[in-house]
Amino acid sequence: TIPPHVQKSVNNDMIVTDNNGAVKFPQLCKFCDVRFSTCDNQKSCMSNCSITSICEKPQEVCVAVWRKNDENITLETVCHDPKLPYHDFILEDAASPKCIMKEKKKPGETFFMCSCSSDECNDNIIFSEEYNTSNPDLLLVIFQ
């Protein structure tokens, strides 16, 4: 058998390499598709998704979509290829280590989406950038 480090490259997007031919490890993401949520008016929420999946393609990142309409609130957690739009939107923040929610214009509902590229990063969805950037250790130093 020929190990992967000497295999000729094949036309298959299950294998992703950088410029030096290194293989990319796949992302681990929360993947519960669409579920009802109680997350509302909070700076951050946990997904409450118990399924962590190995993303099928190594280029995929973690995505979370929060939607609120007159009837309910849902949270969607998936893997997705950032080269492709999701819900008709580009994943602009796919390289971020944290899932920082950004509002998108959708008629008839409030729609937030985030994407990120660290393991299970779509488990903790953050609606406040201030919440994300504040450093508790720094505050401790300031107030001492």
Epitope: P3, H5, Q7, A22, V23, K24, F25, I54
Partner: nanobody, 124 residues
Framework: EVQLLESGGGLVQPGGSLRLSCAAS???????RMWWVRQAPGKGLEWVS?????????YYADSVKGRFTISRDNSKNTLYLQMNSLRAEDTAVYYC?????????????????WGQGTLVTVSS
């Protein structure tokens, strides 16, 4: 430097079982997330399953969920893959690989990160 050596592959009938092992030489086995990766003839790599070093939390590709079980014995520096209800589409060379915390890429030439592979053939 850790070297990885897989064993346990072979020919098995559809519906049968196999247990793969991956022995790691070296003392840093417990620092790494370990993976089973497979490559079918003419196809790309498929990341089958992973297991954390501490707590032994496990992850599976949808294609093997409910059929394959990954485990590790840190005292023996060994990774395992129990494969049940095998199908023809599970035919591949199976590799073990290791991933350090926050590591996103692994060089294909790094023999200390990849095993040489063991061939699993599922056929009647």
């Amino acid at each position: 430097e850790v070297q990885l050596l897989e064993s346990g592959g072979g020919l098995v009938q559809p519906g049968g079982s196999l247990r793969l092992s991956c022995a790691a030489s070296g003392s840093t086995f417990t620092e790494y997330r370990m993976w089973w990766v497979r490559q079918a003839p003419g196809k790309g790599l498929e990341w089958v399953s992973a297991i954390e070093p501490i707590g032994h939390r496990t992850y599976y590709a949808d294609s093997v969920k409910g059929r394959f079980t990954i485990s590790r014995d840190n005292s023996k520096n060994t990774l395992y893959l129990q494969m049940n209800s095998l199908r023809a589409e599970d035919t591949a060379v199976y590799y073990c690989a290791k991933q350090a915390p926050n590591q996103r890429y692994v060089a294909r030439g790094r023999l200390d990160y990849w095993g040489q592979g063991t061939l699993v053939t599922v056929s009647s």
